[in-house]
């Protein structure tokens, strides 16, 4: 049994850590492996994760940890019963994807005027809390070629546009995900979309 | 709750020899680094040996080098501290303590008393 | 080793005041630090590790600060129960020194 593609680690700052990696044939992961890990420094066991499958020889772990800082340094080691298979180390702060936003909500209410908003995925106490900016993706289920992406680089989690720069009477899709340019971070996975119907009042023309 | 809870303490000459443990209850003691930590009279904390979850590694601080052996038996979720060739300057209160998952000392004994004089 | 100076040795504040406690590393330590308040009597206690990470159930009035060689223990507001002993550590390498310590005393 060998490693083919040796794990690969990302965290999203804040309790989970998650490791990819692929053997060389297919593996049952959760009964044949056990991935180690351990702070550097630290003189206790270390934790172990039960991998689960990812495909024929893939592997995934996710691998808890408490209130990371950027300084963390892990040891990591793959072991198939006695034998080490792989050894490494991760560092959370270099290999960030940060959680999706939640709560995405649109408000049409507001004189013709759409507010998106959405949740901050960290609590305030978390360093990535006040350093989130986000991409909202914008479509029409009727029209693929509608389809659109907001940048907010403000730090509030909300967007506001003009109705009108959406197409009247027919739904939309919108979504958002997040990154954080501090830690030069992926880019989260997006949010669940949320619907609506577009409608406002054409204004009327001058003849 | 998780406890720990030191003896052996006592008044020693210099020169002999005392031996401390330090019993632990309501954590997985085998999965945890120990530490010995004394204070002496009025002074300020002063770490004095560390060993492994399982017994494999140990560290000590220059003082107590060569003097002192710090050691555990897993099974009967005890921590020792051998201290040999006291001197008037081991007198102190020692304290037994657990490594944090994420550092530092989360769980700490109520200490036991060593005085080492003649 | 690794020499921790804290300072002041000694703090003089009144109840509602804003402290703050320093600890400075002979070499860089990076982040591994922790803070503890000992009561007379009593064993010390864990405040914070990793230099800033508030450990459960430590009110939040209590932040660390800091990385390589200098630290910061702050208490934003002190109550009556914060008058205390204070002692840094640094646990790199497998060497775990404390700091001196710093009595904190009502003024």
């Known amino acids: 049994m060998k490693v083919l593609q040796e794990p690969t680690c990302v965290s999203d700052y804040m309790s989970i850590s998650t490791c990819e990696w692929k053997m060389n044939g297919p593996t049952n992961c959760s009964t044949e492996l056990r991935l180690l890990y351990q702070l550097v420094f630290l003189l206790s066991e270390a934790h172990t994760c039960i991998p689960e499958n990812n495909g024929g020889a893939g592997c995934v772990c996710h691998l808890l940890m408490d209130d990371v800082v950027s300084a963390d340094n892990y040891t990591l080691d793959l072991w198939a019963g006695q034998q080490l298979l792989w050894k490494g180390s991760f560092k959370p702060s270099e290999h960030v994807k940060p959680r999706a936003p939640g709560n995405l909500t649109v408000h049409t209410n507001v004189s013709d005027t759409l507010l998106l908003t959405w949740s901050n995925p960290y609590p305030p106490d978390n360093y990535l809390y006040n350093h989130l900016t986000y991409a909202v993706n914008i479509w029409s289920e009727n029209d693929p070629a509608d389809f659109r992406i907001y940048n907010v680089t403000y730090l509030e989690p909300s967007l506001r546009i003009a109705a009108s720069t959406l197409k009247s009477g027919i739904s939309y899709r919108a979504r958002v995900r997040a990154w954080a340019q501090c830690y030069n971070t992926t880019w989260s996975e997006w949010s669940p979309s949320t619907k609506w119907h577009n409608s406002y009042r054409e204004p009327f023309e001058q003849h | 709750q998780v406890q720990l809870v030191e003896s052996g303490g006592g008044v020693v000459q210099p020169g002999r020899s005392l031996r401390l443990s330090c019993a632990a209850s309501?954590?997985?003691?085998?999965?945890?680094?120990m530490y010995w930590v004394r204070q002496a009279p009025g002074k300020g904390l002063e770490w004095v040996a560390v060993?492994?979850?399982?017994?494999?590694?140990?560290y000590y601080t220059d003082s107590v080098k060569g003097r002192f052996t710090v050691s555990r038996d897993n099974s009967k979720n005890t921590l020792f501290l051998q201290m040999n060739s006291l001197r008037a300057e081991d007198t102190a209160l020692y304290y037994c303590a657990k490594e944090s998952s994420s550092y530092g000392l989360d769980v700490w004994g109520q200490g036991t008393t060593v005085t080492v004089s003649s | 080793d690794i020499q921790m100076t804290q300072s002041p040795s000694t703090l003089s504040a009144s109840v509602g005041d804003r402290v703050a406690i320093t600890c400075r590393a002979s070499?860089?330590?990076?982040?591994?630090l922790a803070w503890y308040q000992q009561k007379p009597g009593k064993a010390p206690k864990l405040l914070i590790s990793k230099a800033s990470s508030l450990k459960s159930g430590v009110p939040s009035r209590f932040s660390g600060s800091g990385s390589g060689t200098e630290f910061t223990l702050t208490i934003s507001s002190l109550q009556p129960d914060d008058f205390a002993a204070y002692y840094c550590q640094q646990y790199n390498s497998y060497s775990y020194t404390f700091g001196q310590g710093t009595k904190l005393e009502i003024k």
């Open positions: 309501g954590f997985t003691f085998s999965s945890y680094a």
């Open positions: 060993i492994s979850y399982d017994g494999s590694n140990k």
């Open positions: 070499q860089s330590i990076s982040n591994w």
